[in-house]
């Protein structure tokens, strides 16, 4: 027998996710004590079976990693958390139903800036998630969202700033003065779904013009 | 070289099915985003479907919701558009094209579909 | 979906002319904006991409400029070779959409 929370030993029960990895998370309430264990349910979502999360049964921290077990980005699910405590009954908060697709947060993106004399590259990496394909191959965010590009800005002494956007890895800004300091950007967006990450940024200060010296 | 090259294309009488199929080659066929695109005798050029070949994810236009479906096989590098339910209005040249580097800059030659009875 | 309005659906021009087409979008696009040829009977050729940005091996009397929801085509001298369709293509969000075409003919 399991009744709803009304001692405040279970709070705040949620999926958090970034790029695919989801995380279950949890508060223990006023009530809970260094005691207090838990106990992860999960279910996709038109399904009545709970299955048991193996590794978060009578644990005492307060997350379960799901990813895996919630890896199909095209399904919902749904997770419960029951917390016991010495002497009392136990008691049972579920989620919000979870779609890692329309949830996930997007990280920033991973970007070599390499400078040169009078231009700087960026080269963006591609994102792995721990979402497969049917082959077993990693997926990217790319071949996740057919929509995701990326925003490129180059500051320089918060006065002027360049701009590019692509679906493209690699970028360029040219027509740079040589030795200079800049600050790059690059964030990346998927319209459709409205996520946006935060930005990598890279301070790169391109190279000396060098050519004076051998006229 | 970048190829792609369209067949299955013909004549079909309203209501009935047809399944296009592009043979693909010249880059890495098994990590794209792939496309059906029509033209419909002297219009424009609408995007009726698109695939991902690794995760398997697949958009459509609603005009083709429900009737058509793209699908792969990535061990033949052959993309493939099952049309059924098929009405006057899919007569059209049926072409593949694909992104790559970000940009859909290589479409093949076209099939023709005539639905008419 | 976003609808890309094309102008005009036809123009006639002499060699050499200058020669400008119009894209617009009912929503910001941003600079995810291409431009194609297509000559009867051949597949699209992409010329612009970025909506300003010159694909390699075009000819730099083409040109693309605009951002959010207007965006021109600019054929600065039109050589015999120029006259065919010209499509204006938006890849912000699926469905990708066209442009309805612009037929370039001579006068």
């Known amino acids: 027998h399991t009744t709803v929370d009304t001692s405040g030993l279970l709070q705040h029960v949620k999926f958090q996710s970034s790029n695919f990895e989801n995380i279950l998370t949890w508060d223990g309430g006023p009530a809970s004590t260094s005691d207090t264990v838990y106990s992860v349910e999960y279910k996709k979502y038109g399904e009545r079976k709970w299955l048991a999360k193996a590794g978060c049964q009578r644990i005492t921290q307060k997350f379960c990693n799901l990813t895996m077990e919630t890896r199909n980005h095209t399904e919902f699910y749904y997770a419960k958390v029951t917390a016991v405590s010495a002497g009392g009954p136990p008691v049972t908060k579920m989620t919000d139903r979870f779609s890692s697709l329309q949830h996930t947060t997007i990280k920033p993106p991973d970007v070599t800036c390499i400078p040169k004399v009078r231009s700087i590259q960026m080269l963006v990496h591609p994102t792995l998630t721990p979402v497969l394909s049917e082959d077993g191959h990693q997926l990217t965010l790319e071949e996740i969202f057919h929509d995701l590009f990326y925003r490129l800005e180059l500051h320089v002494n918060h006065t002027y700033q360049m701009h590019l956007e692509g679906k493209q890895r690699e970028y360029e800004f040219l027509g740079l003065t040589p030795d200079t300091e800049f600050l790059g950007s690059i964030t990346i967006l998927t319209p459709i779904l409205s996520k946006e990450s935060a930005p990598y940024v890279c301070r790169v200060k391109t190279l000396p013009d060098r050519t004076w010296a051998y006229s | 070289e970048v190829q792609l090259v369209e067949s299955g294309g013909g004549l079909v009488q309203p209501g009935g099915s047809l399944r296009l199929s592009c043979a693909a080659s010249?880059?890495?066929?098994?990590?794209?985003?792939m496309y059906w695109v029509r033209q419909a005798p002297g219009k424009g050029l609408e995007f009726v479907s698109v695939?991902?070949?690794?995760?398997?994810?697949?958009h459509y236009v609603e005009s083709v919701k429900g009737r058509f479906t793209i699908s792969t096989d990535n061990a033949k590098n052959t993309l493939f558009l099952q049309m059924n339910s098929l009405k006057s209005e899919d007569t059209a040249v049926y072409y593949c094209?694909?992104?790559?580097?970000?940009?859909?800059?290589?479409w093949g030659q076209g099939t023709q579909v005539t639905v008419s009875s | 979906d976003i609808v890309m309005t094309q102008s005009p659906s036809s123009l006639s021009a002499s060699l050499g002319d200058r020669v400008t087409i119009t894209c617009q979008a009912t929503?910001?696009?941003?600079?995810?904006l291409s431009w194609y040829q297509q000559k009867p009977g051949q597949t699209p050729k992409l010329l612009v991409y970025?909506?300003?940005r010159l694909q390699t091996g075009v000819p730099s009397r083409f040109s693309g400029t605009g951002s959010g929801t207007k965006f021109t085509l600019t054929i600065s001298g039109v050589e015999a070779e120029d006259l065919a369709s010209y499509f204006c293509?938006?890849?912000?969000?699926?469905?990708?959409?066209f442009g309805q075409g612009t037929k370039v003919e001579l006068k």
């Open positions: 293509l938006q890849d912000y969000s699926w469905p990708l959409t």
């Open positions: 695939i991902n070949t690794r995760s398997g994810i697949t």
């Open positions: 929503q910001s696009i941003s600079t995810f």
């Open positions: 094209a694909t992104r790559i580097q970000g940009l859909i800059d290589y």
């Open positions: 970025g909506a300003s």
């Open positions: 010249g880059f890495t066929f098994s990590s794209s985003w």
